[in-house]
């Protein structure tokens, strides 16, 4: 055992020499990004003050490309890297095209609607006078690859102009434009040449040791990993943690079970109950409020304000108000709640899919007229999984190097 | 060419109310906003408030809240001004003005209407 | 007495250039971009001529200019011809109203 505990030190750390180097640089592992959309059924009935009913259509599926670029060894035991992703659309597993329309909540017209709320009528008043002259409504109908990789539309100039540096879009806004051949921000992490016990953890992320998007300290810190490989020799007590960029705060995985996964060892991770819930059902998240119902995350300070919300897909796990406010969601364990499957001994996920959603807070705001008699209501845009799986020669190294060669070298 | 045509000169009692309309044509009446600004005799101008028709949002400077009432009708294009409790004070020309966007920016008090002269005298 | 602060009167030759302060304060023209300016002939009705503080309406002579320094606007127009007689006024808008100037008397010698 302290020779394969030997070759797997020797062979995990972010060394170019090592066996799993290219492996941490240039992910093997395809991965899938499947996208449902909840297609709005009743817009004008909303705008009269009906309950939403949506209908999920998808999944439109991409293939993630990922690539870490700008690699630089630092002299304290740490790898700078930027990480690059890229998306493909696949047609054969998606069901649907690029080119299908969803009527959609428009997000800029109704995410500015709940941000001026509070603001002097006269302001609002030029507000809905903006949205009726260039055509804004308070619900859209766009297709697949508009609301993912951005439509034009001229209300992005518009905040551009009164709201300068408030918003990250420059003449289209999308979705997921953001993240599609760009980087999720400057990533320093821990090599674990000089100390194995640091190994992926982040030091770093775009030169910040937390961030300020919270309002305590305990949200605000940067903790785990990349959100990629783990610390080896994992137990059932130990945690999955990682900072999402993304969702702009560290999350916590915990152990439920051990299992095999193409005759690789592994343990499970899953999301607790809490990491949604809201800060009166478990205090730590205080610091993520103001908080609607629980097991929703008001991600709005660090989402150019609009009121957004991620939470697991179909409100799993959440308030069950959220769920009966909208007809069309079917909140199901097997189907909505994410998970890791992690090979303890490396640290290295063999199969994941993470899953979340995202979702608006809409209603009717006085001045906007646009909002019509909307009731409040946190009503889902979209979820997603994020999913890969190791294969091919890959997993097959990796089943020779990890599983095949110590059980020969033990006999 | 967009022209505001107002209603013709009043003279009313103190105490009494008087009602300004403003008639929109040449443009998409509900495209627009519509405000209405005074003008005491040999003073500066004063906003009272304004509407937009398509959603029958209105807003009231608060020197005026609760005397002045701010109406449309997309069915004839106008707006219309009611000012109650008239006092001498109020004696002013009225105007009407459109307020517009454009994805160049806000025209606040775009094109104005001739006025309407409203004497409040016993 | 007015929100904006202007002068009373100012007056130029043909040819010349004048230009025309509107003192606010922070709250209204230093707070906001939505700094205008109209030009009302005696007996007319008011026209606006600069928008958003520098912005031109379609129609409206390139002699005339708008700026904004910290919570003072001007209006500034060059070439000075006899139709440019008239009262001018700024307005801002100012924590949910419309505030104008006193308005200024330009007299063109």
């Known amino acids: 055992p302290s020779l394969i505990k030997q070759q797997v030190l020797k062979n995990v750390r972010i060394d170019p020499s090592s066996l799993s180097f290219n492996m941490w640089k240039e992910i093997p592992i395809p991965f899938y990004l499947s996208v449902y959309f909840f297609d709005v059924m009743n817009p004008s009935e909303i705008l009269k003050g009906e309950k939403p009913q949506v209908r999920e259509r998808g999944p439109y599926v991409y293939r993630e490309f990922r690539h870490k670029s700008n690699i630089t060894f630092n002299n304290n035991d740490t790898v700078s890297f930027l990480e690059y992703r890229t998306f493909q659309f696949q047609p054969s597993k998606s069901h649907g095209s690029e080119s299908d329309y969803i009527v959609m909540p428009n997000i800029l017209v109704l995410g500015a609607a709940v941000m001026m709320e509070n603001k002097p009528m006269t302001l609002k008043l030029i507000m809905t006078l903006a949205f009726t002259t260039l055509g804004e409504r308070a619900f859209m109908n766009r297709t697949v690859g508009e609301i993912m990789w951005g439509y034009k539309d001229p209300l992005v100039n518009l905040i551009n102009k009164y709201f300068p540096g408030m918003f990250p879009f420059k003449d289209k806004f999308g979705l997921f434009a953001e993240l599609n051949n760009s980087d999720s921000g400057l990533f320093t992490v821990f090599t674990g040449v000089q100390n194995i016990s640091r190994i992926h953890l982040v030091d770093k992320w775009n030169g910040l040791s937390k961030v300020d998007f919270w309002h305590s300290d305990q949200c605000n810190m940067i903790n785990g990993t990349s959100g990629q490989m783990w610390p080896p020799f994992m137990t059932p007590e130990s945690s999955l943690e990682f900072y999402s960029p993304e969702a702009c705060r560290s999350m916590k995985l915990m152990y439920k079970e051990s299992g095999v996964f193409e005759g690789i060892p592994t343990y499970r991770f899953v999301a607790p109950k809490t990491l949604f819930a809201n800060g009166s059902i478990y205090p730590p998240n205080e610091g993520f409020c103001p908080c609607l119902e629980s097991g929703i995350q008001n991600v709005s300070t660090c989402r150019f304000s609009a009121p957004l919300f991620l939470s697991h897909p179909h409100f799993l796990n959440a308030d069950p108000v959220l769920a009966e406010a909208v007809t069309g969601l079917h909140p199901n364990q097997e189907a909505h709640s994410l998970f890791l499957d992690i090979h303890p001994v490396t640290g290295i996920p063999m199969n994941c899919s993470v899953k979340l959603q995202l979702s608006l807070y809409m209603k009717s705001v006085a001045g906007i007229g646009q909002t019509g008699k909307i009731e409040p209501v946190v009503l889902p845009l979209l979820w997603f999984a994020e999913s890969g799986a190791m294969e091919g020669e890959t997993l097959h190294t990796f089943y020779t190097q990890l599983v095949l060669m110590p059980k020969v070298m033990h006999y | 060419q967009v022209q505001l045509v107002q209603s013709g000169a009043e003279v009313k009692k103190p105490g009494s109310s008087v009602k300004v309309s403003c008639k929109a044509s040449?443009?998409?009446?509900?495209?627009?906003?519509f405000s209405w600004v005074r003008q005491a005799p040999g003073q500066g101008l004063e906003w009272m408030g304004g509407?937009?028709?398509?959603?029958?949002?209105?807003n009231y400077a608060q020197k005026f809240q609760g005397r002045v009432t701010i109406t449309a009708d997309e069915s004839t294009s106008t707006a219309y001004m009611e000012l109650s409790s008239l006092r001498s004070e109020d004696t002013a020309v009225y105007y009407c003005?459109?307020?517009?966007?454009?994805?160049?920016?806000?025209?606040?008090?775009?094109?104005w209407g001739q006025g309407t002269l409203v004497t409040v005298s016993s | 007495q007015s929100a904006l602060t202007q002068p009373a009167s100012v007056s130029g030759s043909p040819g010349q250039s004048i230009t025309i302060s509107c003192t606010g304060t922070?709250?209204?023209?230093?707070?906001?971009?939505?700094v205008y300016w109209y030009q009302q002939h005696p007996g007319k009705a008011p026209k606006l001529m600069i928008y958003?503080?520098?912005n031109r309406p379609s129609g409206v002579s390139n002699r005339f200019s708008g700026s904004k320094s910290g919570n003072t606007a001007s209006l500034t127009i060059s070439g000075l011809q006899a139709e440019d007689e008239a009262d001018y006024y700024c307005?801002?808008?100012?924590?949910?109203?419309?505030?104008f100037g006193g308005g200024t008397k330009l007299t063109v010698l």
């Open positions: 003005a459109r307020d517009f966007f454009d994805s160049a920016g806000y025209y606040a008090f775009e094109i």
């Open positions: 040449g443009g998409t009446f509900s495209d627009y906003g």
């Open positions: 509407i937009i028709p398509i959603f029958d949002t209105t």
């Open positions: 922070s709250s209204d023209v230093g707070a906001f971009n939505f």
């Open positions: 958003e503080v520098s």
């Open positions: 307005s801002s808008y100012a924590d949910n109203n419309w505030v």
